[in-house]
Amino acid sequence: SEVEYRAEVGQNAYLPCFYTPAAPGNLVPVCWGKGACPVFECGNVVLRTDERDVNYWTSRYWLNGDFRKGDVSLTIENVTLADSGIYCCRIQIPGIMNDEKFNLKLVIKPAKVTPAPTRQRDFTAAFPRMLTTRGHGPAETQTLGSLPDINLTQISTLANELRDSRLANDLRDSGATIR
C-alpha cells in the first residue's frame, strides 16, 4: 500500500523519492506521473529527468532537491484539492523490468484559517504524518549529498526518516517543541 502524505490547499506539497547513482554523474532517468505506477513508464507524466537534467515538466511541478545526487523528490506548488491522489515515482534502471516503482498518496486538506497557536498544535497532532511545505535551503541538500550510499530497498525507510526530520525542522522553526 502507498505511503500517505498531506498538505493544505495553497501550500507546497512534498513527495519524497530517492535513489543512489551507481557512480558520480551516472544518473538514471526518473519519471513522475499522476496515478499509480503502470507496468511500464509513468501515466500522466508531470515531470521527467534524463541522464543529466530535468527534461520535461508541467506547471507547478519541480525538483527542489539535489536530483543529481539521487534526490528526485517532487514539489507541487500551491496545491488544490484536485491535486489529491496517487503519484508514481519511477526510477528507470536500465535492463528488463529493473525499474523501481513507488506509489505515494497525496491527501490535500482544506486550508484552515486559525491563529498561530492552533497551527502549532496541528503540527504536533499530525506527527509523524505531517508533510513539510517549506524547504530548508542548501544545508539540507548538502546533508543529503553526504549521506552514505544506500540501496533501493532502503529508500522507503529513508523517505520516512526524512519526512520526520523535516517535520522536526518545521516544529523547531515554528517555536513548537517535540515531545
Epitope: 558520480p24 543529466r52 537534467d53 519541480w62 525538483l63
Partner: antibody, heavy 120, light 107 residues
C-alpha cells in the same frame, strides 16, 4: 592542469559550414560533458548543446537543431562542433566548456574561444 | 525555455563597495544556478555553482544565495580587479540559459 585549447578564427560565407575543435588535456576526457556556448559581439551567452564523450550522447538547443552537430574523438581527447547553413547572425565567439558532476554541470573550465565571422 | 532575468544591467561602484545583483528564473530551478565573471577579451570564469558554493580558489568576498526562482550574487568589498561582467546561468533544464549580464563599472 586542465586545459581546453580551441582551433583558430574562421571567416565564412553565408550558407557555408564551420567546424570548431576543442582539444582537452589534464583530465579524463570521457568523464566529463563538453558543452558549447557562443557569444555574439557585445552580447550575452547562448548555449548550443552538449556531448558526453563516454557514451556519445548529445543534447542540442532546439534553436540550432538540424544545423549543429557535436562529435568527439576519444583517441585525441578532442571535441568538435559543426554549425551548418551559416547566417550573419551566427557571427560570434564560440566556446567549449567542461561540464562536471562536481560543479553540478556548471562550467569549471572554458576554452579560449574561437571567433567565427560570417560575412559575404 | 527558462528565462533568467538579471538586474541591474550596469552597476556603478567604487573600491570597497558592497554590491549585489539578482537573477530571477521564470520557473523554479531548485539550486541549479551558477555565476560567472567575464573580463574583456577573456573566457568566462566560474565563481559560484549550485547557487551558493564558491568554486575552488574564488575569494570569499564573492557569495551566492537563493533557491527556487530568486538568486542573489554579492561582492562584499569590490576590488579593482573585480570590474567585469557577471552572468548567472540555470543548469536545471536544457536549454541552459544565461542572464543578460551585469557590468560593474567605476563610479
Amino acid at each position: 592542469q586542465v586545459q581546453l585549447v580551441q582551433s583558430g578564427a574562421e571567416v565564412k560565407k553565408p550558407g557555408a559550414s564551420v567546424k570548431v575543435s576543442c582539444k582537452a588535456s589534464g583530465y579524463t576526457f570521457t568523464d566529463y560533458y563538453m558543452d558549447w556556448v557562443r557569444q555574439a559581439p557585445g552580447q550575452g551567452l547562448e548555449w548550443l548543446g552538449y556531448i558526453y564523450p563516454n557514451k556519445g550522447g548529445t543534447s542540442y538547443n532546439q534553436k540550432f537543431k538540424g544545423r549543429v552537430t557535436m562529435t568527439t574523438d576519444k583517441s585525441t581527447s578532442t571535441a568538435y562542433m559543426e554549425l551548418r547553413s551559416l547566417r550573419s547572425d551566427d557571427t560570434a565567439v564560440y566556446y567549449c566548456a567542461r561540464g562536471g558532476y562536481y560543479s553540478y554541470y556548471s562550467y569549471d573550465y572554458w576554452g579560449q574561444g574561437t571567433t567565427v565571422t560570417v560575412s559575404s | 525555455s527558462i528565462v533568467m532575468t538579471q538586474t541591474p544591467k550596469f552597476l556603478p561602484v567604487s573600491a570597497g563597495d558592497r554590491v549585489t545583483m539578482t537573477c530571477k528564473a521564470s520557473q523554479s530551478v531548485g539550486n541549479n544556478v551558477a555565476w560567472y565573471q567575464q573580463k574583456p577579451g577573456q573566457s568566462p570564469k566560474l565563481l559560484i555553482y549550485y547557487a551558493s558554493n564558491r568554486y575552488t580558489g574564488v575569494p570569499d568576498r564573492f557569495t551566492g544565495s537563493g533557491s527556487g526562482t530568486d538568486f542573489t550574487f554579492t561582492i562584499s568589498s569590490v576590488q579593482v580587479e573585480d570590474l567585469a561582467v557577471y552572468f548567472c546561468q540555470q543548469h536545471y533544464s536544457s536549454p541552459y540559459t544565461f542572464g543578460t549580464g551585469t557590468k560593474l563599472e567605476i563610479k
